[in-house]
């Protein structure tokens, strides 16, 4: 089929030739019996552009057609063309351009003696001619016409219809429904694209996202979706994603962490009002916010600790002297003194030097404000010199030494390898130069180690190294020591200082000379 945008359709419906005469009033010859004049009628149709005065001459600018013989004299024509397969009714004139809305039409009824001779040039064959011009809008409706010329009548109708997928007044609008990546639409009455549900845009290629999907922060690949751009979330993609780790904060834009009231820090995790939210201070202490989620507690008397959770024991360590017993009071204490002592901490004695209160040879002197004091000899302490000093109690000896209390002094018995008053000096075990043959000595704890020069080994570097120890001879050779050197005795077929070379093979013969050498290798 010729590509076109529309089709002019002409439907021949009825032809009447009352007397069976030609246009020149002659009788149609070739009639097969009565009536004597029988016009075997066919038609020439010429469709052309609008002419004010229609010329029947070619060219038929919009198309032409010649029908087969359709009847004799007077006859009706059914839709579809009837028995003759060579003729279809209506006659179709395809258009490959915009329908202009006007046309000229020439229809000639012609007679032929033979159905095979449909020549139209002979004017003597003409029965009648219709020449008309019309305005015609595109549409499905048929326009009916009747042409009468004295002896003949021709009833016909015509229309111009758009081809499939063509629309508009001139069938110039192309629209083919589709539902693929290039569009999702059907076609309206005027050829406009009618988007399928869920699609929009001039070519219906843009999906309609989930209603409410944020225009800026959401998008979709198919209808009803709402996919979020980076930094946004939620069903409608209008919720910003906060800075990762943001705790008590919000955002207006992605990756923000705008702290809620009472919170601070990069992650809004620092409680700026810790005192109110957590009430950390105990026992009636005063709480002060210091920012960044921290606080300080000012304790009431008698309490201590970061949150004032600990009651202070004023009796620890015991302040009472001379065996007085201590009673813990709030933010204070009191001492109950044994007989013969008084004062806040039982530091004063009711005795005098006359009572001989100093022990272990302590020298007594009376105090002007009452009481006395003892000056203790070496090795004793206490108010009355009653305590013997243990000089070893402070563990003065180092490195596992034993401490011996001498009464007025101490002595450290050192472990092997250490010396000095406190046994903290490591004895130099290299002082006696124990490493032989130029070996380097390294001091240890009651020990030494030697780094030997090449050729020597052993704790003191006194043992020479065996030259054959590291198997310098290859390929099954035997190693022999020669003073400070070694000699390799090669296996048959090998040579070189270490027997590392394969010797060339000798040709077979009766007497093969043993060329194996005993080569000396340097140690």
């Amino acid at each position: 089929q010729v590509w076109s945008s529309g089709v002019f359709e002409l439907k021949l419906q009825e032809f009447v030739n009352k007397k069976g005469l030609l246009g020149n009033r002659n009788c149609c010859r070739g009639g097969a019996g009565p009536p004597p004049c029988a016009c075997r009628t066919f038609f020439r149709v010429c469709l052309k552009h609008y002419q004010a005065s229609v010329s029947p001459e070619p060219p038929c600018t919009y198309g032409s057609a010649v029908t087969p013989v359709l009847g004799v004299d007077s006859f009706s024509l059914p839709d579809g063309g009837g028995a003759d397969s060579a003729f279809s009714n209506p006659i179709r004139f395809p258009f490959g351009f915009t329908w202009p809305g006007t046309f000229s039409l020439i229809i000639e009824a012609l007679h032929t003696d033979s159905p095979d001779d449909l020549a139209t040039e002979n004017p003597e064959r003409l029965i009648s001619r219709l020449a008309t011009q019309r305005h015609l809008t595109v549409g499905e409706e048929w326009s009916q016409d009747l042409h009468s010329s004295g002896r003949t009548d021709l009833k016909y109708s015509y229309r111009f219809v758009c081809d499939e997928h063509y629309y508009g007044e001139g069938c110039s609008v192309f629209c083919r429904p589709r539902d693929d990546a290039f569009g999702h639409f059907t076609c309206g009455e005027r050829g406009e694209k009618v988007c399928n549900p869920g699609w929009k845009g001039p070519y219906c290629t843009e999906p309609i996202c989930l209603p409410g999907c944020d225009e800026q922060h959401g998008f979709c690949d198919k209808p009803g979706e709402c996919k979020c751009r980076v930094g946004w979330q939620g069903r409608y993609c209008d919720e910003c994603i906060r800075y990762p780790g943001c705790l008590h904060g919000t955002c207006q834009q992605p990756w923000q962490c705008n702290c809620q009231e009472g919170w601070g820090g990069l992650f809004c995790n620092q409680d700026l009002n810790y005192c109110t939210h957590h009430k950390p201070c105990k026992n009636g202490a005063t709480c002060t916010n210091t920012g960044q989620g921290s606080y300080t507690c000012s304790c009431r008397p008698g309490y201590t600790g970061a949150t004032c959770e600990l009651g202070i024991d004023e009796c620890d360590p015991s302040p009472c002297k001379n065996g007085g017993s201590c009673t813990d009071l709030e933010n204070s204490y009191s001492c109950t003194c044994p007989p013969g002592f008084y004062g806040k901490i039982c530091e004063l004695s009711a005795m005098t030097c006359a009572d001989g209160p100093c022990f272990n040879g302590g020298r007594c002197s009376d105090s002007p404000d009452g009481g006395y004091s003892c000056r203790c000899p070496v090795g004793y302490s206490g108010f009355n010199c009653e305590k013997k000093i243990d000089y070893c109690s402070s563990s003065p000896c180092s490195n596992g030494a034993k401490c011996v209390d001498l009464g007025d002094a101490y002595l450290c018995r050192c472990q092997a390898g250490f010396s000095g008053r406190h046994c903290d000096d490591n004895v130099d075990d290299c002082a006696s130069s124990p490493c032989a043959n130029g070996g380097t000595c390294r001091d240890g704890v009651n020990d030494f180690s030697c780094t030997c020069p090449p050729g020597y080994t052993g704790r003191n570097c006194s043992a020479p190294v065996s030259r054959c120890e590291h198997a310098p001879c290859h390929n099954g050779a035997t190693c022999h020591e020669r003073g400070h050197r070694y000699v390799c005795e090669c296996a048959r077929g090998y040579g070189g200082p270490n027997c590392q070379f394969l010797l060339p093979e000798l040709p077979p013969g009766p007497a093969v000379v043993d060329l194996t050498e005993k080569l000396e290798g340097q140690g």
Partner: antibody, heavy 117, light 113 residues
Framework: EVQLLESGGGLVQPGGSLRLSCAAS????????MHWVRQAPGKGLEWVSF????????YYADSVKGRFTISRDNSKNTLYLQMNSLRAEDTAVYYC??????????WGQGTLVTVSS | DIVMTQSPLSLPVTPGEPASISCRSS???????????LNWYLQKPGQSPQLLIY???NRDSGVPDRFSGSGSGTDFTLKISRVEAEDVGVYYC??????????FGQGTKVEIK
């Protein structure tokens, strides 16, 4: 402080027209989708219309489709509702509301539309 | 359309006592991100509605902590732990999952006994 202020309500005869306005302040108007919600006297809340932040997408309740038109002027921070072919059943207080994640976080004080002959 | 059904429609309360309102949706309001798109509003007498709870259980800023939202899928509850005189008004639930249209419950009128 976010504020929404409706105006344009009043008494109108059936078949008449009215244009409501909603002046927004205290936030970036062009970043938010907006809605109209109405409440008939003594009745509950009824959603009326939606417009996207840029104004390219609009939706309507079936009861007003074809008669009401929602629009916005982001340069003036103003939302509009053009109401044509008004009926008695359109009588209500009309609220404009800001849209966020499926909820209306701020509402105007409302403007009363009375359709009566 | 998603249909929202509230109960009770009227709720007489005693100040200091707890109160509870139920809201049921005709289809699930759970999004793939796990959030429930169900919101609660209070309309005090002569005022515009105000947002109380959004997305199931999130209290809007400035809303007292005596208000709480719970539930998931199709069944939701608004609780007031201790009702105060200022809490009277009409409470509405609203689905924010699908539109058009967004739909509201019929409203629950809370009044002091």
């Amino acid at each position: 402080e976010v504020q929404l202020l409706e105006s344009g309500g009043g008494l109108v005869q059936p078949g008449g027209s009215l244009r409501l306005s909603c002046a927004a302040s205290g936030f970036t108007f062009s970043s938010y989708a907006m809605h109209w919600v109405r409440q008939a006297p003594g009745k509950g809340l009824e959603w009326v219309s939606f417009i996207s932040s840029g104004g390219s997408t609009t939706y309507y309740a079936d009861s007003v489709k074809g008669r009401f038109t929602i629009s916005r002027d982001n340069s003036k921070n103003t939302l509009y509702l053009q109401m044509n072919s008004l009926r008695a059943e359109d009588t209500a207080v009309y609220y404009c509301a800001r849209f966020r994640s499926g909820y209306f976080d701020y509402w105007g004080q409302g403007t009363l539309v009375t359709v009566s002959s | 359309d998603i249909v929202m059904t509230q109960s009770p429609l009227s709720l007489p309360v005693t100040p200091g006592e707890p109160a509870s309102i139920s809201c049921r949706s005709s289809q699930s309001l759970v999004h793939s991100n796990g959030a429930d798109y169900l919101n609660w509003y209070l309309q005090k007498p002569g005022q515009s509605p105000q947002l109380l709870i959004y997305k199931g259980s999130n209290r809007d800023s400035g809303v007292p902590d005596r208000f709480s939202g719970s539930g998931s899928g199709t069944d939701f509850t608004l609780k007031i732990s201790r009702v105060e005189a200022e809490d009277v008004g009409v409470y509405y639930c609203q689905q924010g999952y699908d539109f058009p249209p967004f739909t509201f419950g019929q409203g629950t009128k809370v009044e002091i006994k």
